[in-house]
């Protein structure tokens, strides 16, 4: 069990040459609760989104987004019909963001190479993004001890580790492997973080009643990495990881709460539902 | 806890426009859809549109295109919904709604009469 | 636009009884690649706003009780009552989840007998 990853390819349809479609994957085995797709940078740090997919309350999309959808259970792709002559796309970047439990918030770019002919590849040059993300969560000598040894181990780990099991057979996209922090526990969430936050609502007193396919089960089967002619490489960015954190400032005291009193921080609240989530969610 | 509060009862005559609030509370209101909904007297629900407050990017019912327009203001975490050129059967109770009609305003009846 | 149609207008079911309403989309809300329907269900009183029940056709809102269930697939979905309460006297809508525009059913108007 790998520590997450997520994937974004930027496509151009080779058919017509202002039509662009973003994939992204979530690798990893959690339950994705939600998915933001952005542009011109991550969701919150100045990027506008264009879609936000909900694995059953469904979509929104704003233009240029023409179609959000879920490919798997844990890949989504959204078609952009570009209305400019210049094709704006070319030079974009697109962020997508999995929300999942337990992992936590995970986001990932990508932007359509330099070369605007559908079907060539250029190298991709991962740029990290850097977000305080951590800030206030653990005492500073607390993170930096935990967190230097952790990288050190995953650094070490990676450098053993042979080429990613879900790396596609074209050379046109690549399976991020960067790793990052991941949460360790819902006491986290009593800090502020506007952009980073997840479902918490995971409830194993409750699977019995939970829907089959809702956000109790945890997939596990590999993302779907589009193929095809069209393909074109992805510029990657950097995955990033976040612990779980509350989107709404009023809820930054809830630690003070007891158990299960309303939108609290708890390991398991409330354990199914959009009211329940929406004050975990920074996005829509 | 999540809340929608919406501006009170409205008359208009036909012809007019009539601008309706919906300030929400207990979230981040640049992050999430503020949806629009209305209801005909003994009749169904309608969508009419959704804003996103962070980058105002709106989504139009094509029914009410031209007629209606959308608009959010982050500093007050007050979204609006206008409607122009009523008439007698734009008469209902005109609802907002946020996280895919997971919540609600306590709705604005809008009467159109002469 | 999907159309959806609901059966019947108005039901009237006695106290302790099993409630049934359906609901058929004009396309298919599911959606293949994650094999989810999106349907969802709402409850209004009067002089209230809808109150969401179920979501994704069978995933029950939090805090409805469990009385309530939602099933079906595709174009063809069903809310069920197992047995009903006086509270539950409202109006049903089921709403398209899947593509824009969000379109709601006509209603069904729930009495007891």
């Known amino acids: 069990a790998g520590t997450p990853e997520v994937w974004v390819q930027v496509q151009m349809e080779a058919t017509e040459l202002s039509s662009f479609t973003v994939h992204c994957g979530f690798l990893g085995p959690g339950s994705i609760s939600l998915v933001t797709v952005s542009w011109g940078g991550p969701d919150g740090a100045g990027g506008t989104k264009l879609a936000v997919l909900h694995p059953e309350l469904g979509t929104r999309q704003w233009a240029p987004a023409r179609q959000a959808r879920w490919e798997t259970q844990s890949s989504i792709s959204l078609a952009l019909e570009d209305s400019g002559a210049s094709s704006p796309f070319a030079n974009t970047t697109f962020c997508c963001k999995f929300a999942s439990f337990p992992e936590g918030s995970w986001e990932s770019c990508g932007s359509l190479p330099p070369s605007s002919d559908p079907g060539l590849s250029a190298p991709p040059t991962p740029v990290p993004i850097l977000r305080a993300d951590l800030a206030g969560i653990l005492g500073l000598s607390g993170v930096l001890l935990f967190g230097c040894g952790y990288l050190l181990h995953l650094l070490r780990r990676q450098k053993h580790r042979p080429t990613p099991r879900l790396q596609p057979s074209h050379t046109n996209s690549q399976a991020l492997t960067a790793q990052a922090w991941a949460p360790s526990q819902a006491s986290q969430a009593a800090l502020h973080d506007p952009y980073a936050t997840i479902n918490t609502s995971f409830c194993p007193a409750t699977l019995d009643t939970a829907h089959p396919n809702g956000w109790a089960s945890l997939p596990t089967h590999a993302a779907h990495q589009p193929q095809g002619p069209a393909a074109s490489a992805s510029t990657p960015i950097l995955a990033r990881g976040s612990f779980v954190s509350v989107e709404n400032g009023l809820y930054t005291q809830a630690g003070e709460r007891p158990p299960h009193t309303g939108p609290g921080l708890t390991l398991f609240p409330d354990c199914r539902g959009p009211r329940a989530l929406e004050g975990r969610f920074g996005v829509r | 806890e999540v809340q929608l509060v919406q501006s009170g009862a409205e008359v208009k005559k036909p012809g007019s426009s009539v601008k309706v609030s919906c300030k929400a509370s207990g979230g981040t209101f640049s992050s999430f859809s503020i949806e629009w909904v209305r209801q005909a007297p003994g009749q169904g629900l309608e969508w009419m549109g959704e804003i996103l407050p962070g980058s105002n990017s709106t989504n139009y019912n094509e029914k009410f295109k031209g007629r209606v327009t959308i608009t959010a203001d982050e500093s007050t975490s007050t979204a609006y919904m206008e409607l122009s050129s009523l008439r007698s059967e734009d008469t209902a109770v005109y609802y907002c709604?946020?996280?895919?009609?997971?919540?609600w305003g306590q709705g604005t009846l809008v009467t159109v009469s002469s | 636009d999907i159309v959806m149609t609901q059966s019947p207008d108005s039901l009237a079911v006695s106290l302790g009884e099993r409630a049934t309403i359906n609901c058929k989309s004009s396309?298919?809300?599911?959606?293949?690649?994650?094999?989810?329907?999106?349907l969802a269900w709402y409850q209004q009183k009067p002089g209230q706003p809808p109150k969401l029940l179920i979501y994704g056709a069978s995933t029950r809102e939090s805090g409805v009780p469990d009385r309530f269930s939602g099933s079906g697939s595709g174009t063809d979905f069903t809310l069920t009552i197992s047995s009903l309460q006086a509270e539950d006297v409202a109006v049903y809508y089921c709403q398209n989840a899947h593509s824009y525009p969000p379109t709601f059913g006509q209603g069904t108007k729930l009495e007891i007998k």
């Open positions: 709604a946020r996280y895919w009609f997971a919540y």
């Open positions: 396309q298919s809300l599911l959606n293949s690649g994650n094999q989810k329907n999106y």
